[in-house]
Amino acid sequence: IVNGSDCQKDAQPWQGALLLGPNKLYCGAVLISPQWLLTAAHCRKPVFRIRLGHHSMSPVYESGQQMFQGIKSIPHPGYSHPGHSNDLMLIKMNRKIRDSHSVKPVEIACDCATEGTRCMVSGWGTTSSSHNNFPKVLQCLNITVLSEERCKNSYPGQIDKTMFCAGDEEGRDSCQGDSGGPVVCNGKLQGLVSWGDFPCAQRNRPGVYTNLCEFVKWIKDTMNSN
């Protein structure tokens, strides 16, 4: 997150981290039920660990943390690398969470976000594209949902109904390492961090997010059948 601020501890209890090896964060994730996470489809890796209930970027033990393995990764069938459409994936964890003030699921929004809606994006991603600086703790940033027209003008020919743009003034954006993390609007999960320009946080180049209202049925059906 570029130019965000430290999240309040336990204010984003649905925020997850996907880790490679002992503690190599490569993507965010969102807890949507006691045993299921959502993340971006482009975050798919054969082996990874899941960390929930953690505030710090470092591997230091925190009393609220819970660690899991992913036992099933189910990318949306419409996702195809290197495209960005349908950029979501369900992860089934090896066990259910222990519900606590640090670890709680978030409800997915059934209605699509409208222009001007204020939302919160969060993650442990880099705070600067050019220098790969990482934050000490989870970062939060208020962003505004942009109109479809403005979104399409920012990225001609690259935006479809499975995406929405959100941002603020130049210099504030999600960034590398935030992928798959939550965009929460009015207390409901509206989107996942997906893509944007490189470097992040450029004028008229907003972040692009997976538009989860388009996938509520697929998410429910997939969870029920697995």
């Epitope: 482009h42 880099t126 790969n132 972040g207």
Partner: antibody
Framework: QVQLVQSGAEVKKPGSSVKVSCKAS????????ISWVRQAPGQGLEWMGL????????NYAQKFQGRVTITADESTSTAYMELSSLRSEDTAVYYC????????????????????WGQGTTVTVSS | DIQMTQSPSSVSASVGDRVTITCRAS??????LAWYQQKPGKAPKLLIY???SLQSGVPSRFSGSGSGTDFTLTISSLQPEDFATYYC?????????FGGGTKVEIK
């Protein structure tokens, strides 16, 4: 199987410019960056810069800033490296190489290596 | 810029030997390190990416390890075709930089 095919050897005078091309055959640049790396005779590898063809965004090593221009034409899947104000120390083999752009435009944080390389183009600078 | 220091600069070894090459970054680069093999007159070939992931088609006698600033490339049992020069490269941040290379020669 994607191959990167580079233009032929060049002999140039000091002070002039050279433009080397790199064409992807059997595939496209979609989802990749293209780096340029040079190797002077008997020396190691030196990264010059790269381009993300999808956006045209380029990044250069400070040493070459102002002298090198990297461009790409997505429609022909060809990247170009132009080096100006040539001097004898620029005599080298110039390689283009492909790297996955994952972790750049998408907002994951993962870095791949350069998995496909061109055959190299020898540039000789001599008066 | 991040400096990459490789050691040794050359090593003499025999077929069947275990060879270890080290690479040190001047600052932390997480696991974003690649290893390449280069033979005379040829382009480099990617062996390892993300410090320890074996590139498709590369023999399993090659392995990589390390994180942060210190990294290692190991050839578990040297084969005749492995005599070459090996380079590490950080791909953590621009400008990408290479180590000076390690030449593996026949003893």
């Amino acid at each position: 199987q994607v191959q990167l095919v580079q233009s032929g050897a060049e002999v140039k005078k000091p002070g002039s410019s050279v433009k080397v091309s790199c064409k992807a055959s059997g595939g496209t640049f979609s989802g990749y960056s293209i780096s340029w790396v040079r190797q002077a005779p008997g020396q190691g590898l030196e990264w010059m810069g790269l381009i993300f063809p999808i956006s045209g965004t380029a990044n250069y090593a400070q040493k070459f800033q102002g002298r090198v221009t990297i461009t790409a034409d997505e429609s022909t899947s060809t990247a170009y490296m132009e080096l100006s104000s040539l001097r004898s120390e620029d005599t080298a083999v110039y390689y283009c190489a492909r790297q996955s752009a994952s972790g750049y435009y998408d907002r994951s944080y993962y870095r791949y290596g350069m998995d496909v390389w061109g055959q190299g183009t020898t540039v000789t600078v001599s008066s | 810029d991040i400096q990459m220091t490789q050691s040794p600069s050359s090593v003499s070894a025999s077929v069947g030997d275990r060879v270890t090459i080290t690479c040190r970054a001047s600052q932390g680069i997480s696991s974003w390190l690649a290893w390449y093999q280069q033979k005379p007159g040829k382009a480099p070939k990617l062996l390892i990416y993300a410090a320890s992931s074996l590139q498709s088609g590369v023999p399993s006698r090659f392995s990589g390890s390390g994180s942060g600033t210190d990294f290692t490339l190991t050839i578990s049992s040297l084969q005749p075709e492995d005599f070459a020069t090996y380079y590490c490269q950080q791909v953590s941040s621009f400008p990408y930089t290479f180590g000076g290379g390690t030449k593996v020669e026949i003893k």
